[in-house]
C-alpha cells in the first residue's frame, strides 16, 4: 500500500492471550459514575487485517442490516457502501429499510489518492457489541468510489469518530458520535485498544482473531496497565494534540518543537503509519539508522517500500531503537512521554513471508500534513478519547507486542517549558480547499 494514503491500516491478534490481561499497576482517583469499570460486552469487539483496518460490527436500518465498519478517528462521516462493488461482500440496501430517510443531498470526499461519493440520508444505527442503544444517525450511502474499499479487508464502511468541523459536505452534518451522545445517556467518551499481532495473519486467522476493543462511553481497566496520562485536545476538529519533544533511544532530536506539529499533530486510527513532517522524518530516520548502524538496510526500506526479511524468529529487535514522543500534559509546564518499540514501527507483512521468513515494512513515513499518530503508535497503547473533558489519555496496552527486554511505556511527569509555543497556527483558508486524507 502507498504510505501516502490515509487508508488502509492494520490490525491483528493481541500480544497477550485472551483472558490473560496484565493487572493494572496503579489506581487513579475515581471520576464521574458510568465512565470506568468493566465493559465486558464491548471488549474484543474489533477485528481486522494487517494494513487494512480495524472494524466493528454495526447494524443499519429496519430490519437491521449488519455491516463491518472501519473505526476511523481521523474523519467525521459515517459512510457505508450502498451499491455493488467488486470488493464488497455486502452493502447497505436503503430500499429495504423502512426507517431510511433521504436528505436529498450529495456528498463528495476526495482523498490525496482516491475518493468516494454518495447520497446523504439518516437511519437507525446500533452497535451489537456496544452500548444497548439505537440512534438515528446521518449516513452517507456510498454509490461510487475509487481506491477506497480494499480487496479482502472485510469492512464495508467507515465510522468517522472525529468532530463536526471536518465532516463533509460541511460541519452542519452531525457525526455519529455526537448523535449517539445527544440521543442517549452514553457518556461523551470512547476508548480504543488496537492489538497488533506482531506477525502476519491470513484471511481465516483474521476472521477468527481479535483485533482489539472499542469501549463506547467508558474506560475498561482490563485493557491497560499502569496509569493513564492525558494530553489536551488542542482543537476539536481532528483529535489534535501537541508533541513537545521527540527522542530516539533517549537521544533528543533537538528540533524546534513547532516542527513536530507542523502543520498539526493528530491521533488517527485510520492511518497505518506513524507519519512525520518532512524535516522531522528525515531527522528521525537519520537517528534510527545511526542507532542500528551495525546493519545497513536498503534505501527502499526506509521509504516504506522494500521489505526486509529475517529467518523466522530471528528478527534482531535489539538493534532497533525505541521512539519516545513527549506530549503536552494537563498541568502547566508538565509533559509525559509515550515510548514505542520496533515491534510497533516494523510492520509484519502478510503474503510475502514464508514459514522460513519474517518480513517487515518500515512503518514510519513522511507527511506534508503534519504528524499522524496512526496504528503504529496506537497499537502500543490504550487510548482514551475523552471528548467531555477535551483530552486524550494514553496507557500501556495490555495487548501490545514486546519482548523480554523492552516494553512500550507511558511515563511522567517531565518539566517542559513554553509548550504552547510548540503548536502551529494554521493560516485560515477557504474550507473548500482542504484535502481529506494526506499528501
Amino acid at each position: 500500500t502507498q504510505h501516502g494514503i490515509r487508508l488502509p491500516l492494520r490490525s491483528g491478534l493481541g500480544g497477550a492471550p485472551l483472558g490473560l490481561r496484565l493487572p493494572r499497576e496503579t489506581d487513579e482517583e475515581p471520576e464521574e459514575p458510568g465512565r470506568r469499570g468493566s465493559f465486558v460486552e464491548m471488549v474484543d469487539n474489533l477485528r481486522g487485517k494487517s494494513g487494512q483496518g480495524y472494524y466493528v460490527e454495526m447494524t443499519v436500518g429496519s430490519p437491521p442490516q449488519t455491516l463491518n465498519i472501519l473505526v476511523d478517528t481521523g474523519s467525521s462521516n459515517f459512510a457505508v457502501g450502498a451499491a455493488p462493488h467488486p470488493f464488497l461482500h455486502r452493502y447497505y440496501q436503503r430500499q429495504l429499510s423502512s426507517t431510511y430517510r433521504d436528505l436529498r443531498k450529495g456528498v463528495y470526499v476526495p482523498y490525496t489518492q482516491g475518493k468516494w461519493e454518495g447520497e446523504l440520508g439518516t437511519d437507525l444505527v446500533s452497535i451489537p457489541h456496544g452500548p444497548n442503544v439505537t440512534v438515528r444517525a446521518n449516513i452517507a450511502a456510498i454509490t461510487e468510489s475509487d481506491k477506497f474499499f480494499i480487496n479482502g479487508s472485510n469492512w464495508e464502511g467507515i465510522l468517522g469518530l472525529a468532530y463536526a468541523e471536518i465532516a463533509r459536505p460541511d460541519d452542519s452534518l452531525e457525526p455519529f458520535f455526537d448523535s449517539l451522545v445527544k440521543q442517549t445517556h452514553v457518556p461523551n467518551l470512547f476508548s480504543l485498544q488496537l492489538c497488533g499481532a506482531g506477525f502476519p495473519l491470513n484471511q481465516s486467522e483474521v476472521l477468527a482473531s481479535v483485533g482489539g476493543s472499542m469501549i463506547i462511553g467508558g474506560i475498561d481497566h482490563s485493557l491497560y496497565t499502569g496509569s493513564l496520562w492525558y494530553t489536551p485536545i488542542r482543537r476539536e476538529w481532528y483529535y489534535e494534540v501537541i508533541i513537545v519533544r521527540v527522542e530516539i533511544n533517549g537521544q533528543d532530536l533537538k528540533m524546534d518543537c513547532k516542527e513536530y506539529n507542523y502543520d498539526k499533530s493528530i491521533v488517527d486510527s485510520g492511518t497505518t503509519n506513524l507519519r512525520l513532517p518532512k524535516k522531522v522524518f528525515e531527522a528521525a530516520v537519520k537517528s534510527i539508522k545511526a542507532a542500528s548502524s551495525t546493519e545497513k538496510f536498503p534505501d527502499g526500506f526506509w521509504l516504506g517500500e522494500q521489505l526486509v526479511c529475517w529467518q523466522a524468529g530471528t528478527t534482531p529487535w535489539n538493534i532497533f531503537p525505541v521512539i519516545s514522543l513527549y506530549l503536552m500534559g494537563e498541568v502547566t509546564n508538565q509533559s509525559f512521554r509515550i515510548t514505542i518499540l520496533p515491534q510497533q514501527y516494523l510492520r509484519p507483512v502478510e503474503d510475502v513471508a514464508t514459514s522460513q521468513d519474517d518480513c517487515y515494512k518500515f512503518a514510519i513515513s513522511q507527511s506534508s500534513t503534519g504528524t499522524v499518530m496512526g496504528a503504529v503508535i496506537m497499537e502500543g497503547f490504550y487510548v482514551v478519547f475523552d471528548r467531555a473533558r477535551k483530552r486524550i489519555g494514553f496507557a500501556v496496552s495490555a495487548c501490545h507486542v514486546h519482548d523480554e527486554f523492552r516494553t512500550a511505556a507511558v511515563e511522567g511527569p517531565f518539566v517542559t517549558l513554553d509548550m504552547e509555543d510548540c503548536g502551529y497556527n494554521i493560516p485560515q483558508t477557504d474550507e473548500s480547499t482542504l484535502m481529506t486524507g494526506r499528501a
Epitope: K296, Q306, L307, D351
Partner: antibody, heavy 120, light 108 residues
Framework: QLQLQESGPGLVKPSETLSLTCTVS??????????WGWIRQPPGKGLEWIGM???????WYNPSLKSRVTISVDTSKNQFSLKLSSVTAADTAVYYC????????????WGRGTLVTVSS | EIVLTQSPATLSLSPGERATLSCRAS??????LAWYQQKPGQAPRLLIY???KRATGIPARFSGSGSGTDFTLTISSLEPEDFAVYYC??????????FGGGTKVEIK
C-alpha cells in the same frame, strides 16, 4: 575503477570446506554504501545467491545454505571471503563475488568468477 | 516466497529485430526488479534496475518496463553482441536472493 577478483582452489574434495577470497581493488571495501556478496552458478544452470556482508561484519545468508556458509571481511586487506563446509558434487559451480549497490539492492559490479569443482 | 518466472525460455531472433522478454512475479514486487545480461563464459552484468532505470554504460536500445507482477525487457534492435542469457531479479523482499530462471536470446 573498482574491480573484484575471486581466488581460491578450483578443486575441492567432497565433505571438505570450500574457501574463496574476493579482493577489491580501485576502491574501499569499507564504503557505507555497499554490501559485498557471493553468487554461484552450477554448470548450465541459473544464478543462486549465497550471501553477503557489510564492512562492519554484518552478514546475510541464503537460508538453504546458512548452516554451511560463513562469509567474513578483512578491511585491512580490502578482501571478503566465503567458506562453504561439507561440500558435495551439487556445490560444483562458478562462484562470483559482487558488489551490492544502487540503494543496497542490486549486484552492480561482478568479479569474473571462478569454477570450483567438487570431486574426489 | 516470491517466485520469478521468465518467458520464453528461448527466443530465436535475427540481428536488427526487436526482442521482448517477460518476467512475471508470483506477487507484487512494486518496481524493485532488475535485469542482468550474461554472455557465455562471462559474469552477469546489470542492465536495468528499479524496473526501468538503465545502469551506467548500458546502451539506449535496452529498456525496461512494468511494475507489480509483470515486467518486460525490450531490446529495440538486436546487435550481434546482445545474444546472451538474460535474468531478472526482485529485491522487493530483501536481502536480494531471488532470480528468475533466465531467457536465452539466440541467433535465428
Amino acid at each position: 575503477q573498482l574491480q573484484l577478483q575471486e581466488s581460491g582452489p578450483g578443486l575441492v574434495k567432497p565433505s571438505e570446506t570450500l574457501s574463496l577470497t574476493c579482493t577489491v581493488s580501485g576502491g574501499s571495501i569499507s564504503s557505507s554504501s555497499y554490501y559485498w556478496g557471493w553468487i554461484r552458478q552450477p554448470p548450465g544452470k541459473g544464478l543462486e545467491w549465497i550471501g553477503m556482508i557489510y564492512y562492519s561484519g554484518s552478514t546475510w545468508y541464503n537460508p538453504s545454505l546458512k548452516s554451511r556458509v560463513t562469509i567474513s571481511v578483512d578491511t585491512s586487506k580490502n578482501q571478503f571471503s566465503l567458506k562453504l563446509s561439507s561440500v558435495t558434487a551439487a556445490d560444483t559451480a562458478v562462484y562470483y563475488c559482487a558488489r551490492v549497490g544502487h540503494g543496497i539492492s542490486y549486484f552492480d559490479l561482478w568479479g569474473r568468477g571462478t569454477l570450483v569443482t567438487v570431486s574426489s | 516466497e516470491i517466485v520469478l518466472t521468465q518467458s520464453p525460455a528461448t527466443l530465436s531472433l535475427s540481428p536488427g529485430e526487436r526482442a521482448t522478454l517477460s518476467c512475471r512475479a508470483s506477487q507484487s514486487v512494486s518496481s524493485y526488479l532488475a535485469w542482468y545480461q550474461q554472455k557465455p563464459g562471462q559474469a552477469p552484468r546489470l542492465l536495468i534496475y528499479d524496473a526501468s532505470k538503465r545502469a551506467t554504460g548500458i546502451p539506449a536500445r535496452f529498456s525496461g518496463s512494468g511494475s507489480g507482477t509483470d515486467f518486460t525487457l525490450t531490446i529495440s534492435s538486436l546487435e550481434p553482441e546482445d545474444f546472451a542469457v538474460y535474468y531478472c531479479q526482485q529485491v522487493y523482499t530483501w536481502p536480494p536472493r531471488t532470480f528468475g530462471g533466465g531467457t536465452k536470446v539466440e541467433i535465428k
